[in-house]
Amino acid sequence: IIPVEEENPDFWNREAAEALGAAKKLQPAQTAAKNLIIFLGDGMGVSTVTAARILKGQKKDKLGPEIPLAMDRFPYVALSKTYNVDKHVPDSGATATAYLCGVKGNFQTIGLSAAARFNQCNTTRGNEVISVMNRAKKAGKSVGVVTTTRVQHASPAGTYAHTVNRNWYSDADVPASARQEGCQDIATQLISNMDIDVILGGGRKYMFRMGTPDPEYPDDYSQGGTRLDGKNLVQEWLAKRQGARYVWNRTELMQASLDPSVTHLMGLFEPGDMKYEIHRDSTLDPSLMEMTEAALRLLSRNPRGFFLFVEGGRIDHGHHESRAYRALTETIMFDDAIERAGQLTSEEDTLSLVTADHSHVFSFGGYPLRGSSIFGLAPGKARDRKAYTVLLYGNGPGYVLKDGARPDVTESESGSPEYRQQSAVPLDEETHAGEDVAVFARGPQAHLVHGVQEQTFIAHVMAFAACLEPYTACDLAPPAGTTD
């Protein structure tokens, strides 16, 4: 399908001239940022962004790649080097330390310098590094964390936690020896390390003692509380804060976000991770866009501004399953949240960054026709005389042999939301990838986001833009509408 207008060179010259005109008009804002928003697409490598762009375009009955995503409209872009101190290919814990704290760490550790060792509790103390969110709170801003995973998961935990093992969600996950040495589980750190104004996502089960039935799944023991210390962390959190409210479903969230008496809000909508967007019960669970909107409503009441972390966390899970349909539909919802946040904030006073913590071994190739389904088949046959999909994985659970050979695939199979794209190597989970990821930026000091940078640069740009530690002497004019 070739659009007739695209056959004409004038079409491309005009389009490029418009883009050039917009580029020439770009004026770096010399003011500080009142608000900081970091949108983190977990596992959202560049191939994921491209494929999601096409899918989102096709959902609007367009050919696909020509329709920009919300993140594509951000004027400044850089590449981020995602390696961990000890691994070429990183995990979400140590990368969170990099882009949220500005210091690289070791694989599967969170909020700690590389002097700390994975799983060794006694290497924690003295190696803690402080997140930009924590620094924003100390500067009088309101702060919030929004995610589609558990709020205790690796990426959101980077905003508040310090742990040598990202899997220590509740005290039941922490070895007795580490508990005796004083290492705290991530859920405990969520409520005690700092005062977070808005916490929205999954992860109910880590907050309640073992045997506490889940309100949504009361008959399912496996979804109930997991804590061994007998604590009710939600109750403890509420007791420490006047104007605090806990909600566990969409209706309660909407009510709370509109209630001016609510100053602190914790919404935990699933026992574990939130459901994939395609499986979400829209009457019970809010979407990422709705959670983002609710968070912004509360946080923007603070005249000193806010820091907000928004994670599309299950892009990563879709990829680990080798289910591109899940990864890409999660990416589209993530982009919808970015778009909505853009409507609710001003680029005059809000620095918004969009990035990924790491990529995945997810590829998009095979010369498909323009306008053909992103989940479809490549033209022609492979060497084994069988069809193959344009989306593939380098490794993962999509490796299957039927009678000792690669299975053939049809368009109807590959279009199913449950379909696992094929891979070259069989693994229980498809792996992260080590190539650089994109950083998109808009707002005050966004022009600093350029070139190829260490992932740690992201935290430093945010801190500098808002004149937070260690850049309190930033020498930037205050943003419009700020009150001291």
Partner: nanobody, 117 residues
Framework: QVQLVESGGGLVQAGESLRLACAAS????????VGWYRQAPEKQREWVSS???????DYAEAVKGRFTISRDNAKNTVYLQMNSLKPEDTAVYYC???????????WGQGTKVTVSS
């Protein structure tokens, strides 16, 4: 030291069911995928099933629709419900933990399943 201990094996007739369990010492299951392999006499060890930390399951073609994997993180236990057993399911079944980025592997000692026709 991490230990994985399988149980539940035995001798059954074709068409019957068994439920295998694998309990881990310590907290090794937290955040990791876990699963089962099997090894029939004179054959190579073959993968059977796995489950991620958030519950996504996967099965070998030979057992799809008959076997169901589940996990109880609170009990550090993974289960394999085996229905409509066939003589070709006869093997020693081993549970394992898949740790991202680790070269060290954790395996149990195995539990023997014999299906007679």
């Amino acid at each position: 030291q991490v230990q994985l201990v399988e149980s539940g094996g035995g001798l059954v007739q074709a068409g019957e069911s068994l439920r295998l369990a694998c309990a881990a010492s310590g907290t090794i299951f937290s955040g990791n995928a876990v699963g089962w392999y099997r090894q029939a006499p004179e054959k190579q060890r073959e993968w059977v099933s796995s489950i991620t930390d958030y519950g996504d399951t996967d099965y070998a073609e030979a057992v799809k629709g008959r076997f169901t994997i589940s996990r109880d993180n609170a009990k550090n236990t993974v289960y394999l419900q085996m229905n409509s057993l066939k003589p070709e399911d006869t093997a020693v079944y081993y549970c394992y933990v898949y740790q991202r980025g680790e070269s060290e592997e954790y395996w149990g000692q195995g539990t023997k399943v014999t299906v007679s026709s």
